[in-house]
Interface confidence: medium
């Protein structure tokens, strides 16, 4: 049998006749910034080119004994996980290693920066195909390291990093906290977050997804045929770097935004036991375990969206929180969430020529989060239509009046400290799906988009009696772009999207009472793109879709038990 | 990449008195900021990344680095430029005393300065 981690990232089998074995990442170069490596290990021999880059600090301690096998241990294992002959994810990928960590696994921010600059210069001197950079390291939050990662990402490089092994918020570490980097947490064979001694995988909004990171069999630097089991978020990041290499080899033109959306889309959803995470981090942490796509083509027709949480606003009365999408993504909706329920809603606003989602704290509130729904929508033209608070008892409403524009999201923002629950709930009149409705004392913001073939519909789920959570999901083939609550009353803590489900959270039932005033409706806006579907069908007509996971059929034969040399 | 525009002592002579050297505020009235690792044991004081504003050219980076060295030397401090960045971020890596940070933050083109810190295999 193949190792559990490789099985876990392999999608369920499709019919054999739909598949052609892929090249396993052969068009992609993966740069590894780590310790030195044992490049003549049979797992990676001929697959890894050791560059002359080395920038490491002196080892600590006067009695430190430099032993080659220990110096090479971390990097060799990771190179094996990415592209190893037997236990690797992307067996066709070629790698280049840079030494930025010493024999004790320690490096510096400055050394890492110079390494990233080296990669950029190499890319300019000799442009090759897609580049993936694996950063299986972490330090404290660093503005300069994050900035360098941002620049490299904007130059078209895919950066994958370890979330960190500190059982802490990944946003406190770098490069994990850099938004442009794909940050990976670690899970085990039971889909539990990985515990490492007294610590474990990092978590929180800066993590993009999780991947296998416990008891991972890979190349050992003890001998050229040895294998060893290692654990950590580095191993998890190496899996995602391998998956990214496979995806980019199949579709070399994928942008970073497209790759990230695909990684999220093809991940296993809601399999992680969230009880392991601190309570306040559960809602922020993505419940996603990375997996290879079932086939190399056929994903193009989908409208991909992801949820981006802001940092916490902090408790001051006028505090705000801002959530942003990546440069290539469109902000299709904006919502907010506060654990105390004291918030003043959210609005979409332009910042630097791009829409952002801003949430507002309220007096006595412990702070808010802004939640952006970020989507890939080529040739989109989106704008925000705003209606000021209405005096009429019917409430405030706004719709998309431009021809060809469809409603993708609704936001509401109010200046009053407490909207109160005494007003009757406002219901949307039937037959007017293209409008947002809200409380009469709130201003309402509609996100209206025009894109080829884009169509959207509104889906609601109302519960008359108060409940802590109301959800509504988009059906197969449709993608959730907007998620909001109707009406925006004070007992609603907020709304946010989890995958294709809109979640509206309310205050604890016991504190709300069970009157009709507690009624809450979750409103989902579900969209799809007929244009993307059509383009994809045309593409599939001329290209036979080849499957990514056939490589693992061959691998089942390749994998031999006698390679297991545990230490 | 080698340091281009000659040695910097001539710059020292060109500057005015000991006091007025680099006290001028950076352009646009914006103040450069200093950052360091929140985790104290991971800090590496004595080595700093001086990040310059986005459109700064390599020659300006080198000039700014030499200017810092000249100013530092006049105050009895040694500085060593370990690297000049270009390609990703403009700036330079410098080994110097933390006493010089205030001076360095006032250099023209400086966006922010970050103290070096450790990173670890995960």
């Amino acid at each position: 049998s193949i190792p559990w981690n490789l099985e876990r990232i392999t999608p369920p089998r499709y019919r054999a006749d739909e598949y052609q074995p892929p090249d396993g990442g052969s068009l992609v170069e993966v740069y590894l910034l780590d310790t030195s490596i044992q490049s003549d290990h049979r797992e990676i021999e001929g697959r890894v080119m050791v560059t002359d880059f080395e920038n490491v600090p002196e080892e600590d301690g006067t009695r430190f004994h430099r032993q080659a096998s220990k110096c090479d241990s971390h990097g060799t294992h990771l190179a094996g996980v990415v592209s190893g002959r037997d236990a690797g994810v992307a067996k066709g990928a070629s790698m280049r290693s840079l030494r930025v960590l010493n024999c004790q696994g320690k490096g510096t921010v400055s050394g890492t920066l110079i390494g990233l600059e080296f990669i950029r210069k190499s890319q300019l001197v000799q442009p090759v195909g897609p580049l993936v950079v694996l950063l299986p390291l972490a330090g404290g939050y660093s503005r300069v390291l994050n900035a360098a990662c941002q620049r490299l990402a904007r130059a078209g490089v895919v950066l994958v990093t370890a979330a960190g092994n500190f059982r802490d918020d990944a946003c406190l570490y770098s490069p994990a906290s850099a938004p442009e980097v794909i940050t990976v947490g670690a899970t085990n064979a039971q889909d539990q977050p990985v515990t490492l001694g007294t610590l474990g995988t990092n978590f929180g909004r800066c993590v993009d997804l999780f991947a296998p990171g416990e008891d991972i069999i890979g190349a050992s630097s003890d001998c050229s045929t040895c294998f060893v089991s290692q654990s950590g978020t580095s191993q998890a990041a190496a899996h995602v770097a391998g998956i990214a290499a496979m995806m980019l080899s199949a579709e070399p033109e994928l942008t970073l935004a497209e790759l990230r959306q695909r990684l999220i889309h093809f991940s296993a959803k809601d399999v992680i036991n969230e009880a392991w995470f601190p309570e306040d981090q559960r809602v922020l942490t993505p419940n996603l375990v990375a997996a290879l796509p079932p086939s190399t083509h056929g994903a193009g027709w989908q409208l991909f969206c992801r949820t981006v949480w802001s940092a916490h606003s902090g408790p001051t009365r006028m505090a705000t929180a801002v959530a942003r999408c990546a440069p290539d993504e469109e902000l299709l909706s904006c919502s907010s969430f506060s654990r105390s329920g004291k918030r003043r809603g959210e609005r979409m606003e332009a910042q630097g020529g791009k829409l952002v989602c801003r949430a507002h704290n309220a007096f006595g509130g412990e702070g808010v989060y802004a939640i952006a729904r970020c989507c890939l929508l080529p040739q989109a033209n989106c704008s925000v239509h705003t209606a000021p608070p209405a005096e009429a008892s019917m409430g405030t409403r706004v719709h998309c009046h431009q021809q060809g524009h469809v409603l993708t999201g609704c936001s509401s923002h109010w200046e009053v400290e407490d909207l109160g629950t005494h007003k009757p709930p406002v219901l949307r009149p039937r037959g007017q799906p293209n409008q947002c409705v809200g409380h009469r004392e709130a201003s309402i913001h509609a996100s209206c988009c025009h894109a080829p073939g884009l169509e959207c519909k509104v889906k609601e789920h109302g519960i008359p009696a108060p409940q802590e959570q109301v959800t509504v999901a988009c059906e197969e083939g449709w993608t959730l772009t907007g998620c909001s609550a109707l009406p925006g009353t004070s007992h609603v803590l907020g709304a946010y999207a989890v995958d294709n489900t809109c979640v509206v959270r309310s205050r604890d039932v016991s504190t709300t009472g069970s009157t009709s005033e507690g009624a809450v409706t979750a409103v989902a806006i579900c969209c799809r793109s007929r244009h993307l579907a059509q383009a994809s069908q045309e593409l599939q007509g001329s290209t036979s879709g080849s499957g990514l996971n056939d490589i693992f059929e061959a691998q089942k034969i390749e994998w031999h038990e006698h390679h297991h040399h545990h230490h | 990449q080698e340091d281009e525009d000659g040695d910097y002592e001539e710059l020292v002579l060109a500057l005015r008195s000991e006091e007025d050297g680099l006290a001028e505020a950076p352009e646009h009235g914006t103040t450069a900021t200093f950052h360091r690792c929140a985790k104290d044991p991971w800090r590496l004081p004595g080595t700093y990344v001086v990040v310059l504003k986005e459109e700064t050219h390599l020659s300006q980076s080198e000039r700014t680095a030499r200017r810092l060295q000249a100013q530092a030397a006049r105050r009895g401090y040694l500085t060593k430029i370990l690297h000049v960045f270009h390609g990703l971020l403009p700036g330079f890596l410098v080994k110097m005393s933390g006493d010089l940070l205030e001076l360095a933050l006032k250099l023209p083109h400086v966006d922010y300065i970050e103290e070096d810190s450790s990173v670890f295999a995960q």
């Epitope: - | 009895g76 040694l78 370990l82």
Partner: antibody, heavy 121, light 107 residues
Framework: QVQLVQSGAEVKKPGASVKVSCKAS????????IHWVRQAPGQGLEWMGY????????KFNQKFKDRVTMTRDTSISTAYMELSRLRSDDTAVYYC??????????????WGQGTTVTVSS | DIVMTQSPSSLSASVGDRVTITCKAS??????VAWYQQKPGKSPKLLIY???NRYTGVPSRFSGSGSGTDFTLTISSLQPEDFATYFC?????????FGGGTKVEIK
């Protein structure tokens, strides 16, 4: 122990180039700058420049700037100094030295044994 | 360039003598001065750094002083192994420069 071992003596003709190597051991090569200093027969010491092995950043004495190249190979912990367009007055012993820096204290704490370069027609 | 003028260029002394060598910088180099000892056919060895700090393993008879432009190396009681050439170096400004050297010979 910490040491710098240089390549052997060289005899060159005027106009030729010479490349001297300096192999470091007993410490992390990329952690310290390597300087090159020369000493003509019966003369004093003359600083030529330095390389930061961790980033390849170099700084030269203006006197040698157009003729000197400093490189390194981290895989074998070796620094190189190449001097081109040799003249007879380049006949000297060439030393590499490691520079230690801590606080505001700087010095050359380890020196290579020296490489004699003779330029003669 | 900063010129380091070392004097005397040579001196003769006996074992047990107190020997003083001076170095004058053409401009302020603060305390960024090191002193080295060199024996014939050998590479220089560090004695003093930052004008007055004795390097590890250097006998206590060697001491340094000075700041700004005037620096002194003192050997309090000359020993047979101390007969050599001594150089000062400034590290305040590029290019680093050395004094011309002082040869200490047996009287």
């Amino acid at each position: 122990q910490v040491q710098l071992v240089q390549s052997g003596a060289e005899v060159k003709k005027p106009g030729a180039s010479v490349k001297v190597s300096c192999k470091a051991s007993g410490y992390t090569f990329t952690g310290y700058t390597i300087h090159w200093v020369r000493q003509a027969p019966g003369q004093g010491l003359e600083w030529m420049g330095y390389i930061n092995p961790s980033s390849t950043y170099t700084k030269f004495n203006q006197k040698f700037k157009d003729r000197v190249t400093m490189t390194r190979d981290t895989s074998i912990s070796t620094a190189y100094m190449e001097l081109s367009r040799l003249r007879s007055d380049d006949t000297a012993v060439y030393y590499c030295a490691r520079e230690r820096i801590y606080s505001n204290y700087w010095f050359f704490d380890v020196w290579g044994q020296g490489t004699t370069v003779t330029v003669s027609s | 360039d900063i010129v380091m003028t070392q004097s005397p260029s040579s001196l003769s002394a006996s074992v047990g003598d107190r020997v003083t060598i001076t170095c004058k910088a053409s401009q302020n180099v603060y305390t960024a001065v090191a002193w080295y000892q060199q024996k014939p056919g050998k590479s220089p060895k560090l004695l003093i750094y930052s004008a007055s700090n004795r390097y590890t393993g250097v006998p206590s008879r060697f001491s340094g002083s000075g700041s700004g432009t005037d620096f002194t190396l003192t050997i309090s009681s000359l020993q047979p192994e101390d007969f050599a050439t001594y150089f000062c170096q400034q590290l305040s400004s590029y290019p680093y420069t050395f004094g011309g050297g002082t040869k200490v010979e047996i009287k």
